[in-house]
């Protein structure tokens, strides 16, 4: 806490400018009007204040806005954001994606601090869902963000947001997460034609049920083995030999190399040997 002292004559700040870097902490406290600071927050970042001086500026804003800063101030916090505590941030109501981007940019290159985690949480909860633009922003700043969300959190992702998801965003997702995301992707891409649809849906297929795999087998998609190996075992087991052959197309030969691994192994054991023999791969049921 900085002691309350009168501002020396002639030192009253008329605007936020470089001259303030020569002010002692008590002078900043006494001579800078909090309302002036709030309206000229965008200037603070251009001025090389010390951490101690930034503490004083934060203190002034805290006094002016005890219930939490307005978004007009938050958007221009810049490096002052790094001084905020999660408790400070919980008082905020951040609704603008531009504000979120501005603050994430300030934190770029730093670890995802508890402050940033709180900010993201407040923002997403405020919006009520993880919309496309927000998802775009968060995955750009933090690759892997999508797969760090629980299935419950993912359920708040609207299908329209799925257009923002890149294959690499799903790299670390587990089967339960894909179970949630797949139906959303199916809905999002439903109006695309066969080959384009498959390109988009491919990364999500770890959550696909049997009936959708059967439908895909009728569309000459030529699924690669890497994708096939990530399918749900319970979804693969009911497929017939003919359906798997159609699903994989020229990649069907790859089944031989994977015959001891799930889901291929379990699928083979469910098939009639006569049917397996039609593949000519020497698979033994």
């Amino acid at each position: 806490e900085v002691e309350k002292t009168a501002c020396p004559s002639g030192k009253k700040a008329r605007e936020i400018d470089e001259s303030l870097i020569f002010y002692k902490k008590w002078e900043l406290e006494a001579c800078v009007d909090a309302a002036l600071l709030a309206t000229q927050m965008d200037r603070v970042n251009a001025i090389p204040f010390t951490y101690e001086q930034l503490d004083v500026l934060k203190h002034k804003l805290d006094e002016l806005y005890p219930q939490g800063y307005p978004e007009s101030v938050i958007q221009h916090l810049g490096y002052l954001f790094l001084k905020m505590s999660p408790e400070d941030i919980r008082k905020w109501n951040v609704t603008s994606l531009e504000t979120l981007k501005a603050l994430l940019e300030v934190n770029k290159g730093h670890e995802m601090s508890p402050q940033v985690a709180t900010l993201i949480d407040r923002f997403v909860k405020g919006r009520g869902q993880l919309d496309k633009d927000t998802l775009d922003t968060l995955t750009a700043f933090y690759p892997g963000y999508l797969c760090s969300l629980s299935p419950e959190e993912l359920s708040s992702v609207p299908p329209s947001s799925i257009w923002a998801v890149r294959p690499q965003d799903l790299d670390t997702c587990d089967p339960r997460q894909l179970d949630v995301l797949y139906p959303k992707a199916r809905l999002a891409f439903q109006n695309m034609n066969g080959s384009e649809y498959f390109v988009k849906i491919q990364s999500f297929l770890g959550g696909a049920p049997t009936e959708d795999l059967k439908a895909l087998s009728q569309q000459n998609v030529s699924m690669d083995l890497a994708t096939f190996m990530k399918l749900r075992t319970d979804a693969v087991l009911p497929l017939t030999v003919a359906e798997v052959q159609k699903l994989l197309g020229p990649h069907v030969e790859g089944l031989k190399a994977e015959e001891r691994h799930r889901p291929v192994r379990d699928w083979i054991l469910r098939q009639r040997q006569d049917d397996l023999d039609t593949l000519g791969l020497g698979l033994q049921g």
Epitope: E111, Y142, G144, C147, S148, S150, P151, E153, T172
Partner: nanobody
């Protein structure tokens, strides 16, 4: 560098229990999702269970109701309590952590070296 060390594996009779532990170190201040995988003889690694940043959990169907994942965030440790073990649960069990938003060497995900679980009938 991020390190994961699993322990708690061993040999048990069918119907028995084991509690696996995984201690993570070398990171802080980021979103972490901890997962258990297992790899049976001649098999690929299969996902078993996850505990997400918000503390919720999920399981593969074959272990639901028998296995429980839990974490002690203060100790950066995740546990897998395995009850009613069956011979099909025999495998090397691996811990994996996915980190988002922290500056650490190497790329997420990170894996431990595994702990062997053998269940005899």
């Amino acid at each position: 560098q991020v390190h994961l060390v699993e322990s708690g594996g061993g040999s048990v009779q069918a119907g028995g229990s084991l509690r696996l532990s995984c201690v993570a170190s070398g990171y802080r201040n980021c979103r972490s999702t901890m997962r258990w995988y297992r790899q049976g003889p001649g098999q690929v690694r299969d996902w078993v269970s996850s505990i997400y940043t918000d503390g919720t959990t999920s399981y593969t169907d074959s272990v639901k109701g028998r296995f429980t994942i839990a974490q002690d965030k203060g100790k950066n440790t995740v546990y897998l309590q395995m009850n009613s073990l069956q011979p099909e649960d025999t495998a090397m069990y691996y811990c994996r952590i996915d980190l988002v938003g922290c500056n650490v060497a190497g790329g997420s995900p990170y894996w431990g070296h595994g702990t062997q679980v053998t269940v005899s009938s």
